[in-house]
């Protein structure tokens, strides 16, 4: 009896594992063994696919051909028993366009009111992703065990923290990837259930700020209680996405361990130019808080956000305020490339009512003011940045008398 | 798999120093803290310190903060534990143990193991 | 330093038996505990992480409990290459520190 060829022959490569599944074209027919050949482009001849000769079952796994995954291929499966079937020829694919993204490997920390999430590919240096492994981003769904009601989180990277949530409560998620330069999305991750721990007696320190004073950084934070040490950590933003780097290491601000005021005072140089996460931890001695909140801390914003430096020209009834670029030390203007909103208040010097205009130009009019009367002015500058939305600090007063009547041309 | 594999047994004097070491295989030696315990015959389990083997950040028990340096050698990938000014009571199997990733926010239990070396001390 | 206290220190116990050991820390470690067993010139081996999730290849039976300052390990049915000494761990401050120790014997 002629032996029938195979019928549909799938293909699924998840991550660097390849995997064949095909149907039995007579169920009837026993003892059959079934083998692959594989061809690549431009070749004329025909290979045999190790891993897939002789073949019992009806799948079988070719994860041990080191194949270019950019590269086209097509395969063809016959049934042998003691004659051969014919051929059956599988459309040719290209791997990387036929993978899909494994689950993920995730790592659950807890805290009191917050689960520290740190995802890595279920695959480690995959052939596959090896030119996409830092292009991941992930998405995860996350629920209370107790109640079930999802909640999706997307986009975030290799380390993401979820606050806001209950001590001593159960939380379950799942995650998956995606590789958005090539339109994939992966396969969740198993689900991942952890436990919040019992509420820490210490807080974490809250509203931490950085301003500049001289040649320092000035890191401030607020904390419940007194007679604590504190201790601030740093860590490259960039890493947030590769932790798989050896850099990835959160390490101490030398000045601002074991500080027992709610701020510490750093040299600028203890910062190269770039974008950070900053972290404090609080302690008694006896106990210790969870890490507070992460701060972005970007070098040219945070640092050089300097107060804006304005000339006044009075006149009868209003104020022409035209803004400069801040001074440095040594009287040079600081370059700022990137894009600010000015904040104007401005009061009568014997009256505490102040008033605010709110302008991106740096020319701007204050109308409305009464001739020869004393007027006090300070402004700062924002960051028109959501995600670095950042404030200097208020320039000093000037004050200034307007003109008497008649000289507002 | 994961393997440390520690050097062998010491006899020592007593106001000498042991330098035990610990090589590291089957993982990303710097992606871990190396932690060092030690266990008098008979005894409990004492931790002694840890090591990043990255750039060789240490965190000490402050009982032995002035006698024991960790080191590490990223190139066979070995940490090595220096207990010096030792006494009798310092007689006990050393362990070193792999610790947590140094990349996660709080610190991990000692999931590996060394099969660990007895140093004895004694004049 | 947080002090580790086990109890008891010894228990006797039979193949199949269900078997319990708690461990307290004299301050709070937000689950922060490991759970080892170690047999006779052999190198403490990692049972339970974070109080309460069971190392790989550990077997099913071994599970830990607890939060707050209070912690358990349940053997749910004894088997005869389970005798040895167990010992906690707080990972929570630094120095970390260990529980005396529970030596279980067949009884």
């Known amino acids: 009896k002629n032996l029938k060829s195979p019928q549909k022959v799938e293909v699924d490569i998840i991550d660097d594992n390849f995997i064949l599944r095909w149907n039995r074209s007579d169920e009837s027919v026993g003892n059959v063994t079934f083998s692959f050949d594989y061809q690549k482009t431009g070749m004329d001849n025909w290979i045999k696919l190790s891993g897939c000769q002789n073949i019992t079952s009806t799948k079988c796994n070719f994860s041990s051909l080191k194949l270019n995954v950019y590269e086209e291929i097509k395969l063809r499966i016959r049934a042998e028993k003691e004659n051969t079937s014919s051929w059956y020829e599988v459309d040719s694919f290209t791997p990387f366009r036929k993978a899909q993204i494994g689950p993920p490997e995730v790592h659950l920390e807890a805290e009191d009111k917050a689960i520290v999430i740190h995802i890595s590919p279920g695959t480690k240096d995959s052939v596959m992703w090896a030119l996409d492994g830092l292009s991941f981003t992930y998405s995860l769904v996350i629920w209370k065990n107790s109640s079930g009601v999802e909640e999706r989180i997307e986009n975030i990277y290799s380390r993401h923290k979820i606050y806001k949530l209950s001590p001593e409560t159960t939380y379950c998620l799942k995650v998956k990837a995606a590789l958005l330069t090539s339109w994939k999305i992966g396969v969740y991750s198993p689900v991942h259930c952890i436990k919040t721990t019992v509420e820490n007696e210490l807080p974490p320190p809250e509203n931490i700020e950085v301003s500049v004073q001289n040649q320092n950084y000035v890191l401030k934070w607020d904390y419940t209680y007194a007679n604590m040490t504190f201790q601030v950590q740093w860590l490259h933003a960039f890493l947030k996405r590769n932790p798989g780097n050896h850099l990835y290491k959160w390490k101490q601000i030398p000045d601002c361990e074991n500080v027992k005021t709610t701020q510490c005072v750093f040299p600028q140089n203890v910062f190269q130019k770039g974008i950070y996460l900053l972290r404090v931890q609080a302690s008694d001695g006896n106990n210790t808080s969870f890490w507070s909140e992460e701060i972005k801390f970007d070098t040219e914003i945070q640092a050089f956000l300097l107060p804006p430096v304005f000339n006044i020209r009075s006149l009868s009834d209003s104020f022409h305020i035209y803004i400069g670029a801040p001074k440095q030390s040594g009287n040079t203007p600081v370059i700022q490339d990137y894009p600010l909103i000015y904040e104007i208040i401005f009061w009568e010097n014997t009256s505490n009512a102040e008033r605010k205009i709110i302008e991106k130009k740096t020319d701007v009019t204050v109308p409305n003011l009464k001739p020869l009367t004393v007027y006090c002015v300070k402004a700062r500058a924002h960051t028109m940045d959501e995600k670095l939305n950042k404030s200097s600090v208020f320039s000093d007063a000037v004050c200034e008398k307007t003109k008497p009547g008649n000289t507002s041309k | 798999q994961v393997q440390l594999v520690q050097s062998g047994a010491e006899v020592k004097k007593p106001g000498a120093s042991v330098k035990v070491s610990c090589k590291a295989s089957?993982?990303?030696?710097?992606?871990?803290?190396m932690n060092w315990v030690r266990q008098a015959p008979g005894q409990g389990l004492e931790w002694m310190g840890k090591?990043?083997?990255?750039?060789?950040?240490?965190h000490f028990n402050q009982k032995f903060r002035d006698r024991v340096t960790l080191t590490v050698d990223k190139s066979t990938s070995t940490v090595y534990m220096e207990l010096s000014s030792l006494r009798s009571e310092d007689t006990a199997v050393y362990y070193c143990?792999?610790?947590?990733?140094?990349?996660?926010?709080?610190?991990?239990?000692?999931?590996?193991w060394g099969q660990g070396t007895l140093v004895t001390v004694s004049s | 330093d947080i002090q580790m206290t086990q109890s008891p220190s010894s228990l006797s116990a039979s193949v199949g038996d269900r078997v319990t050991i708690t461990c307290k820390s004299s301050?709070?470690?937000?689950?922060?505990l490991a759970w080892y067993q170690q047999k006779p010139g052999k190198a403490p081996k990692l049972l339970i992480y974070?109080?309460?999730s069971l190392e790989t290849g550990v077997p099913s039976r071994f599970s830990g409990s607890g939060s707050g300052k209070d912690y358990t390990l349940t053997i749910s049915s004894l088997q005869p290459e389970d005798f040895a000494t167990y010992y906690c761990?707080?990972?929570?401050?630094?120095?970390?520190?260990f529980g005396q120790g529970t030596k279980l014997e067949i009884k």
């Open positions: 143990a792999r610790g947590g990733r140094i990349s996660f926010d709080y610190d991990g239990a000692l999931d590996y």
């Open positions: 089957g993982y990303t030696f710097t992606s871990y803290w």
């Open positions: 090591i990043d083997p990255s750039d060789s950040e240490t």
């Open positions: 301050e709070v470690i937000y689950n922060r």
């Open positions: 974070g109080a309460t």
């Open positions: 761990q707080q990972y929570w401050n630094k120095p970390f520190t």
